[in-house]
């Protein structure tokens, strides 16, 4: 767990300024998940300040690595039952020490806010938040104080009197095999799932439930869609299995059937298909790591965080391994630089994602009137006369291949080449021997002389007919 400069955010800075040593405190504040209060409102679920704080003596300009958090836990006692959904606010405060501190002794360095869902008794949840240029690593969990147990700390347990069994009429207390459910002190019939009590004959309801025995979901005024009232006003029952069985609506939402599916009527401050989105607004600063909070059209509607490249999650709280999405095509090597993604392309490929195949005719044209020819997974340029090289960019000597047969002399010309044939031969490449008796000229390829490259011959022939 640490609080320190975030990665890629310039020179690490000390939390202290030039006025001498300082120490950091952490204020943890818990607010209800459906809080309609302002950002600066009371921490209705509880608050606590860290203790046993180390003193930092670095000055600006000195490198400051991640700073150790204060020793020991920050314990935030919460009243009533644990709601499960809540807003967690962590503030990092700096206290300036020394005689020459001057100015305000306390400064708020950073403040992170996020909505969270957490059952009591679960493992530590880890988190990393960035705000300004600081990065805070922390873990949190919710724990019930004995004799309370359960995800909401709403059930009471006590140690077994005998190792083997609980008292008459009392069940073992899961998940604690050595404990038993405490004798019922709540109002008889008080829902064990949705109700709890702190005084005898009392029945307090968890968030989202109402009624004298906490059996009626909030916003449910009557039974809908073939549901019938249950015994002793315990809610509504469904004759057979249906889409609302098990109530898919979270956070106290009430479920109603709609043409084979279901619809959730959410309590104020919750949104989404299953009322899973809590009512934290942009004013709470829920978007981390540079995320921008985009609110709904009205102040009560849910927010969306637009995350900078490299982060994701409803609060931009998760760093993305963008290379795991394999964005580089054609075997390119992916490099995630934090602020940008780079692809190092294999030979023959180019483009930001190595998407351009340089060995593909669509990728690049041949220069100087050359023609692109594909074949065997690669491409080559068939160059116009007078040009050569991979892309026909090099000037070629048309006579270099000795194209004139039978001792003909080659002359380079701006449009190609001209062969001056030896006596007794004719043709574009001096390829025809002239018969003295007036018979037709026939192609001749005497031994020891190279016949013209057919491709060159055809190309040249084609050229001359234009």
């Amino acid at each position: 767990h640490s609080f320190g400069p975030g990665p890629g955010l310039g020179t690490p800075r000390s939390p202290c300024n030039a006025r001498g040593p300082c120490r950091l405190f952490f204020r943890v504040c818990l607010k209800p998940g459906v809080s309609q209060e302002a950002t600066e409102s009371l921490c209705a679920l509880g608050a606590a300040l860290s203790t046993s704080v180390p003193v930092y003596t670095e000055h600006p300009g000195e490198s400051a690595a991640a700073l150790p958090l204060p020793d020991g836990l920050v314990r935030v006692p919460f009243r009533d039952a644990w709601p499960g959904t809540f807003s967690l606010v962590i503030e990092t405060w700096r206290e300036q020490l020394g005689e020459h501190a001057g100015g305000p002794a306390w400064n708020l360095l950073a403040r992170v806010v996020g909505r969270r869902r957490l059952a009591a008794g679960g493992p530590w949840a880890r988190d990393v938040q960035r705000t300004g240029t600081w990065e805070l690593h922390f873990s949190y969990r919710a724990r019930c104080e004995p004799p309370a147990v359960g995800a909401a700390c709403a059930r009471l347990c006590r140690s077994r009197s005998a190792p083997s069994r609980c008292g008459p009429g009392l069940r073992p207390c899961t998940p604690f095999p050595d404990e038993c459910e405490a004798p019922s002190v709540c109002r008889p019939g008080c829902s064990p799932e949705h109700g709890y009590c702190e005084e005898p004959d009392e029945c307090r309801c968890l968030e989202g439930w109402t009624g004298p025995l906490c059996t009626v979901p909030v916003s449910t005024s009557s039974c809908l869609n073939s549901r019938v009232p249950g015994p002793a006003s315990t809610g509504c029952l469904l004759p057979g299995p249906g889409p609302c069985d098990g109530n898919p609506c979270a956070n106290g939402g009430s479920c109603s059937e709609t043409s084979g599916s279901f619809e959730c009527a959410c309590p104020r401050g919750f949104y989404g298909l299953r009322c899973e989105v809590s009512g934290v607004t942009c004013a709470d600063g829920p978007c981390f790591n540079g995320g921008l909070c985009v609110g709904g059209e009205d102040p009560d509607s849910a927010y969306v965080c637009h995350c900078p490249p490299g982060f994701q999650g409803s609060n931009c709280e998760k760093r993305v391994d963008r290379c795991s999405l394999q964005p580089c095509q054609n075997g390119g090597l992916c490099l995630d630089l934090g602020h940008a993604l780079r692809c190092r392309c294999r030979a023959g490929f180019a483009g930001p994602r190595c998407e351009h195949d340089l060995d593909d005719c669509a990728g690049r044209a041949c220069a100087n009137g050359g023609t692109c020819v594909e074949g065997g997974g690669s491409r080559r340029c068939s160059c116009a006369l007078g040009f050569g090289g991979r892309d026909c960019r090099e000037r070629a000597d048309p006579c270099a291949s000795r194209p004139c047969a039978h001792g003909g002399r080659c002359y380079a010309h701006f449009s190609g080449l001209v062969c001056a044939c030896a006596p007794g031969y004719m043709g574009v490449r001096c390829e025809f021997a002239v018969r003295p008796d007036g018979a037709d000229a026939v192609p001749a390829a005497p031994r020891g002389l190279r016949q013209a490259d057919p491709q060159r011959f055809l190309h040249h022939h084609h050229h001359h007919h234009h």
Epitope: A283, G290, G295, H306
Partner: antibody, heavy 118, light 108 residues
Amino acid sequence: QVQLQESGPGLVKPSETLSLTCTVSDNSISNYYWSWIRQPPGKGLEWIAYIYYSGTTNYNPSLKSRVTISLDTSKNQFSLQLSSVTAADAAVYYCARVFHWGFAFDIWGQGTMVTVSS
Amino acid sequence: EIVLTQSPGTLSLSPGERATLSCRASQRVSNTYLAWYQQNPGQAPRLLIYGASSRATGIPDRFSGSGSGTDFTLTISRLEPEDFAVYYCQQYGTSPLTFGGGTKVEIK
């Protein structure tokens, strides 16, 4: 370092649509958000919209009904269209790159002046 | 939307003096997501500060930013001739992104 270049007509008639394009000098268009900001003569800056290659867009509510922003990764360009322009839309229009850590603007084009007149 | 009010509108100082510019927000700027820009006549703005207090690449250390919540300050410890310009603050915590009206720092 990457450079941005705005292009488009400097004169638009009232009620017509203003179209501007910003060309990004390198291949980084898929790595950042890209934005348009304007500044009427002698006045302050007003953010118009931004876009990300994934399709994410966001518009200033005061202009949302008239603005469209789009992006073409193959050309390394992004564009702005502002419909039904009036004299109040006359301004220097800047394209800008959104900073990699937060929605500030770290690289700006030099700006293009748009006049609205018949 | 968050309205940013900059003061003073104009600041008349001499080279070598210290300049203190204020930016006040109508609501809390979340996570100190506030930036400062400098704009010279006929030029595009230049990012100076982000995250309320972090200098952008290549910005001299005479520029510093501070503040949180609704009150933010840009300080130029010792004015150089090239620092006489218009300065804008911008919040990027909540959409829409908004700019302050600007403070002009002029030579006295």
